[in-house]
Interface confidence: low
């Protein structure tokens, strides 16, 4: 069960805390570790037995505005001969991340945190076979 | 959501850039989606590059639990169920954004933090370096 929103906090917090209207929070979108870089193995999207392509989605009312999504190239997996083996399946691997969504309402703007599901890459799996009686 | 006034001159002045600090609604959209990869699929066991999932727990972060993938083998599982070392299991990594309480102990003040997580593993053909 989830408890619904409780309204204002009743507690005395440290004096240095910034004042915040009820029902909202202050969010600094200057990112910690902003310059960290992914050091994945080279070209794994092409070298994988379940290769994938990348598509960049862009939305100026989202922060970050660019989100990269992967799409598996094949239904099956690539075998040692470089051919597609449809006895195996290429499947997407997904991960949740947070974004900030900006919404315009007339002359006002509001901000909302949102969880988005990002497809990160693909992996090759043995299929689940359902036998029909 | 929480509304805050836009620039004077609205509606002509369209604010192209996000401000450094914003007030956001506490309610996260899509907050209740399933975050446990063990429950959402069994790919980690069925993959030819299987992985284990390790729970990374940090109560000063949202989400407080993140699952990290560690490839089980250097090689990949072949059709006979054996590890084939002619292929490599490698982690697929992704940068994600999380919330970090800042300043510490302030209940309604956060900063976005970028963290690198290994989400799963994939089987790749190795890069072979030939020594002259």
């Amino acid at each position: 069960r989830k408890i619904p929103k409780v309204g204002h906090t009743f507690f005395q917090k440290p004096e240095s805390c910034p004042p915040v209207p009820g029902g909202s929070m202050k969010l600094d979108i200057g990112i910690i570790n902003e310059n960290q870089r992914v050091s994945m193995s080279r070209n794994i999207e092409s070298r994988s037995t379940s290769p994938w392509n990348y598509t960049v989605t862009w939305d100026p009312n989202r922060y970050p505005s660019e989100v990269v999504q992967a799409q598996c190239r094949n239904l099956g997996c690539i075998n040692a001969q470089g051919k597609e083996d449809i006895s195996m399946n290429s499947v997407p691997i997904q991960q949740e991340t947070l974004v900030v969504r900006r919404k315009h309402q007339g002359c006002s703007v509001s901000f909302q945190l949102e969880k988005v599901l990002v497809t990160v890459g693909c992996t090759c799996v043995t299929p689940v076979i359902h036998h029909v009686q | 959501g929480i509304t805050i006034p836009r620039n004077p001159g609205c509606p002509n002045s369209e604010d192209k850039n996000f401000p450094r600090t914003v007030m956001v609604n506490l309610n996260i959209h899509n907050r209740n989606t399933n975050t446990n990869p063990k429950r959402s699929s069994d790919y980690y066991n069925r993959s030819t590059s299987p992985w284990n999932l390790h729970r990374n727990e940090d109560p000063e972060r949202y989400p407080s639990v993140i699952w990290e993938a560690k490839c089980r083998h250097l090689g990949c599982i072949n059709a006979d169920g054996n590890v084939d070392y002619h292929m490599n299991s490698v982690p697929i990594q992704q940068e994600i954004l999380v919330l970090r309480r800042e300043p510490p102990h302030c209940p309604n003040s956060f900063r976005l933090e970028k963290i690198l997580v290994s989400v799963g593993c994939t089987c790749v053909t190795p890069i072979v370096h030939h020594v002259a």
Epitope: K2, I3, K5 | L26, E57, P59, Y62, S64, F110
Partner: nanobody, 119 residues
């Protein structure tokens, strides 16, 4: 699986005392702030008390300050609420809740224990 089980509620006369307990399992108890939340009949939820991970800081809603004491035993994965000088307006279902970093939300909470203050 995360579980929170409250106990210790009951009928008590005004001015009396009760001690509520909450047994926690399925998560690293010592890593989380814990809360007592109550819901009076026909009313909304009210955050009663918070205790930090190591028990060093406690916070209370004004109406219970000086009467209620929140405590925890991390070795036993247990949370407590000592309620003294009880008043009729303390009548409510009391819930134990595990804190998430996002304020005003709890990701897990128990089934509740009813406290009735009446003469």
């Amino acid at each position: 699986e995360v579980q929170l089980v409250e106990s210790g509620g009951g009928l008590v006369q005004p001015g009396g005392s009760l001690r509520l307990s909450c047994a926690a399992s399925g998560f690293t108890f010592s890593s989380y702030s814990m809360y007592w939340v109550r819901q009076a009949p026909g009313k909304g939820l009210e955050w009663v008390a918070e205790i930090k991970q190591d028990g060093s800081e406690q916070y209370y809603v004004d109406s219970v300050k000086g009467r209620f004491t929140i405590s925890r035993d991390n070795a036993k994965n247990s949370l407590y609420l000592q309620m003294n000088s009880l008043r009729a307006e303390d009548t409510a279902v009391y819930y134990c809740a595990k804190g998430e970093i996002l304020p005003l939300y709890f990701d897990y909470w128990g089934q509740g224990t009813l406290v009735t203050v009446s003469s």
